[in-house]
């Protein structure tokens, strides 16, 4: 697994370097998670032909994965810093149950899956410190999450492979949109 941000050897060797700003730390954290997702996607794609799945087939799912929309204020047109930040944090909180699901889905990248999950928790904490309007952030219901997790784990193997592929793809897209938006803040 790649070294988490703030723990790389270069930081230790260069004590006189300026400490990272909050925005830089968030940027670095997202890029670190994206690297982890790339590694997980590589294993998924090598294992099966899921990555060739058509967009139509992937669209026919009943997963409620977070997705950026125009109204969220994260796109260049209609950009709204506060609304967008709330959306990013809420979305990441909603992704957590899916990241938990991924934990037993990888054979050779088990540590990588754990690193993505833990790094996302850290990212949420960073972003919550940045947000002014924490009251607007809705936390997913633990009971609903528990039953969703049970349901996902009960699926047949093909559906679990497809679900894994879709979660990784959607999470990557969400983080890329978040990264672009956060760079405007």
């Amino acid at each position: 697994a790649p070294v988490p941000p703030g723990e790389d050897s270069k930081d230790v060797a260069a004590p006189h370097r300026q400490p990272l700003t909050s925005s830089e730390r968030i940027d670095k954290q997202i890029r670190y998670i994206l690297d982890g997702i790339s590694a997980l996607r590589k294993e998924t794609c090598n294992k099966s032909n899921m990555c060739e799945s058509s967009k139509e087939a992937l669209a026919e799912n009943n997963l409620n994965l977070p997705k950026m929309a125009e109204k969220d204020g994260c796109f260049q047109s209609g950009f709204n810093e506060e609304t967008c930040l709330v959306k990013i944090i809420t979305g990441l909180l909603e992704f957590e149950v899916y990241l938990e699901y991924l934990q037993n889905r990888f054979e050779s990248s088990e540590e990588q899956a754990r690193a993505v999950q833990m790094s996302t928790k850290v990212l949420i904490q960073f972003l919550q410190k940045k947000a002014k309007n924490l009251d607007a952030i809705t936390t997913p219901d633990p009971t609903t999450n528990a039953s969703l997790l049970t349901k996902l784990q009960a699926q047949n193997q093909w559906l679990q492979d497809m679900t894994t592929h879709l979660i990784l793809r959607s999470f990557k897209e969400f983080l890329q949109s978040s990264l672009r938006a956060l760079r405007q803040m």
Partner: antibody
Framework: EVQLQQSGPELVKPGASVKMSCKAS????????MHWVKQKPGQGLEWIGY????????KYNEKFKGKATLTSDKSSSTAYMELSSLTSEDSAVYYC????????????WGQGTSVTVSS | DIVLTQSPASLAVSLGQRATISCRAS??????????MNWFQQKPGQPPKLLIY???NQGSGVPARFRGRGRGTRFSLNIHPMEEDDSAMYFC?????????FGGGTKLEIK
């Protein structure tokens, strides 16, 4: 051709245990999940559980927890099911069935193992 | 668990006619464009024989007179034209998730 060959019929006494086998051929044994299904005489079908031979991960129907134990042996491409503390309620035909994969691979069933519990 | 309700419980059809068996699921058995509904034929003393998998695909060696259709929660098995050899028990089964569940069965006889 995918084939599942199950062990022969068993006549066992109440309270005893029985272990039946399901030998797989024609495919990579560790790449597919193996399910077990029960059918009592003249009745419907009931799912017992499954084993993933890749990592020996198992999942059981609540009703069969403590009754059935699923294991597998990669070297011989064989799945096993052991039934313990047998009663007349356990008299049935037991099937192993390999799970398919999407619309590319269909499920495949064994011929069944008949278990009769009688004193 | 997904409950499968099969109807009718028994059916008598004349040779050459059409037999239709229905199976309704308590929730959708679809996922990513595939319906995980299977149909089996079982004769006394024999193991279940897979006729149709993923709603409409024919099992190997299954005659074309066996047709499966449906998606979501509603499925049907059509046999046309009915032949002598088709007299048996028929079961629907969902393999979308565990526990695998089965319909109560339909006893099909020759009228």
């Amino acid at each position: 051709e995918v084939q599942l060959q199950q062990s022969g019929p068993e006549l066992v006494k109440p309270g005893a245990s029985v272990k039946m086998s399901c030998k797989a051929s024609g495919y990579t044994f560790t790449s597919y999940v193996m399910h077990w299904v029960k059918q009592k005489p003249g009745q419907g079908l009931e799912w017992i559980g499954y084993i993933n031979p890749y990592n020996d991960g198992t999942k059981y129907n609540e009703k069969f927890k403590g009754k059935a134990t699923l294991t597998s042996d990669k070297s011989s491409s064989t799945a096993y099911m052991e039934l313990s503390s047998l009663t007349s309620e356990d008299s049935a035909v037991y099937y192993c069935a390999r799970e398919g994969y999407g619309n590319l691979e269909r499920d495949c069933w064994g011929q069944g193992t008949s278990v009769t519990v009688s004193s | 668990d997904i409950v499968l309700t099969q109807s009718p419980a028994s059916l008598a059809v004349s040779l050459g006619q059409r037999a239709t068996i229905s199976c309704r699921a308590s929730e959708s058995v679809d996922g990513f464009g595939i319906s995980f509904m299977n149909w089996f034929q079982q004769k006394p003393g024999q193991p279940p024989k897979l006729l149709i998998y993923v709603a409409s695909n024919q099992g190997s060696g299954v005659p074309a007179r066996f047709r499966g259709r449906g998606r979501g929660t509603r499925f049907s098995l059509n046999i046309h034209p009915m032949e002598e050899d088709d007299s048996a028990m028929y079961f629907c089964q969902q393999s979308k998730e565990v526990p695998w569940t089965f319909g109560g069965g339909t006893k099909l006889e020759i009228k």
